[in-house]
């Protein structure tokens, strides 16, 4: 099942997912002056079996100007730095992603493709928050996300995570405060049926990942 | 989720004209590559056109130069216009977005 919106937005905060659920559909897109081949791939899709997953099809692109000259080939370290994605800004190696049973690692840079990649998500996947260089996280909780079905509806839960500028001295007083649930929702709200393909072990995986995720940005 | 329903269709005589819609609901409308193809009977399913977010278009060569694909992200639809219809257009056409499908809406162009 397909994810309705996309994850919530957290003002200078970026997201990642670590890894992708099956069924996860990333646009096949070129950035200015390229398109896709007119026989290419519209989106790749996350698929697999019990043992393993990979994206099916390929993207691939070619200059808007001249025709068939389609090449796959991994860009140069200058063409990866423009791209603008999802990805944050500090270099993180957190759990291996092949690890994760049923889902795909990120697909490898196709040449000329968009600065930003758009993922079509499905319920079950988490994404993970951290603040955007010059800015340093307030936790009150998890700094994460889940794409979860209920009541027949698909719904991101709100991750717990404000990003304060370096400068600023307000550091919020009674930060500690508890929420009500992780979501920031009274349980009444989310009491009938969940689907969270998954959860316990991304919960575990994000455990493990909370240090190298918001330690490398002071290192 | 996402639903895709098409209008438009009917019946045309060669050289003639039509617009097909296609009303997207149930996801990000500006998120998605959007795409027209078509089936003739005891034919496969052929790519007609595409339309990326940013408007970049795409165009079966059998097209091109007589159909224009559009969007209007605040509409959530997409557009085929169909022009200098020939009968070998005969078809139902279907909208596509990610792997979902609208229901066809028939094209006959016949004097």
């Known amino acids: 099942e397909l994810c309705d919106d996309d994850p919530p937005e957290i003002p200078h905060a970026t997201f990642k997912a670590m890894a992708y659920k099956e069924g996860t559909m990333l646009n096949c897109e070129c950035k200015r002056g390229f398109r896709r081949i007119k026989s290419g791939s519209l989106y790749m899709l996350c698929t697999g079996n019990s043992s393993h997953s990979s994206w099916d099809n390929q993207c691939q692109c070619t200059s808007s100007a001249t025709r068939n000259t389609t090449k796959q080939v991994t860009p140069q370290p200058e063409e990866q730095k423009e791209r603008k994605t999802t990805e944050m800004q500090s270099p993180m190696q957190p759990v291996d992603q092949a690890s994760l049973p049923g889902h795909c690692r990120e697909p490898p840079p196709w040449e000329n493709e968009a600065t930003e990649r758009i993922y079509h998500f499905v319920v079950g996947q988490m994404v993970y928050y951290q603040c955007v260089q010059g800015y340093r996280a307030l936790h009150r909780g998890p700094a994460e996300s889940v794409c979860k079905m209920t009541h027949g509806k698909t719904r991101w839960t709100q991750p717990q995570l404000i990003c304060t500028g370096e400068m600023e001295t307000s550091q919020f007083p009674g930060e500690e405060k508890p929420q009500a649930s992780p979501e920031g929702r009274p349980e009444s709200e989310t009491s009938c049926l969940v689907t969270t393909t998954d959860f316990q072990i991304q919960t575990e995986m994000a455990a493990t990942m909370e240090t190298s995720i918001f330690t490398t940005e002071y290192q | 989720e996402v639903q895709l329903v098409e209008s438009g269709g009917g019946l045309v005589q060669p050289g003639g004209s039509l617009r097909l819609s296609c009303a997207a609901s149930g996801r990000k409308f500006s998120t998605l590559i959007m795409a027209w193809y078509r089936q003739a009977p005891g034919k496969q399913r052929e790519l007609v056109a595409t339309i990326e977010r940013d408007g970049t278009t795409t165009y079966a060569d059998s097209v091109k130069g007589r159909f224009t694909i559009s969007r209007d992200n605040a509409k959530n639809t997409v557009y085929l216009q169909m022009n200098s219809l020939r009968p070998e257009d005969t078809a139902v056409y279907y909208c596509?977005?990610?792997?979902?499908w609208g229901q066809g809406t028939q094209v006959t162009v016949s004097s």
């Open positions: 596509n977005a990610l792997q979902y």
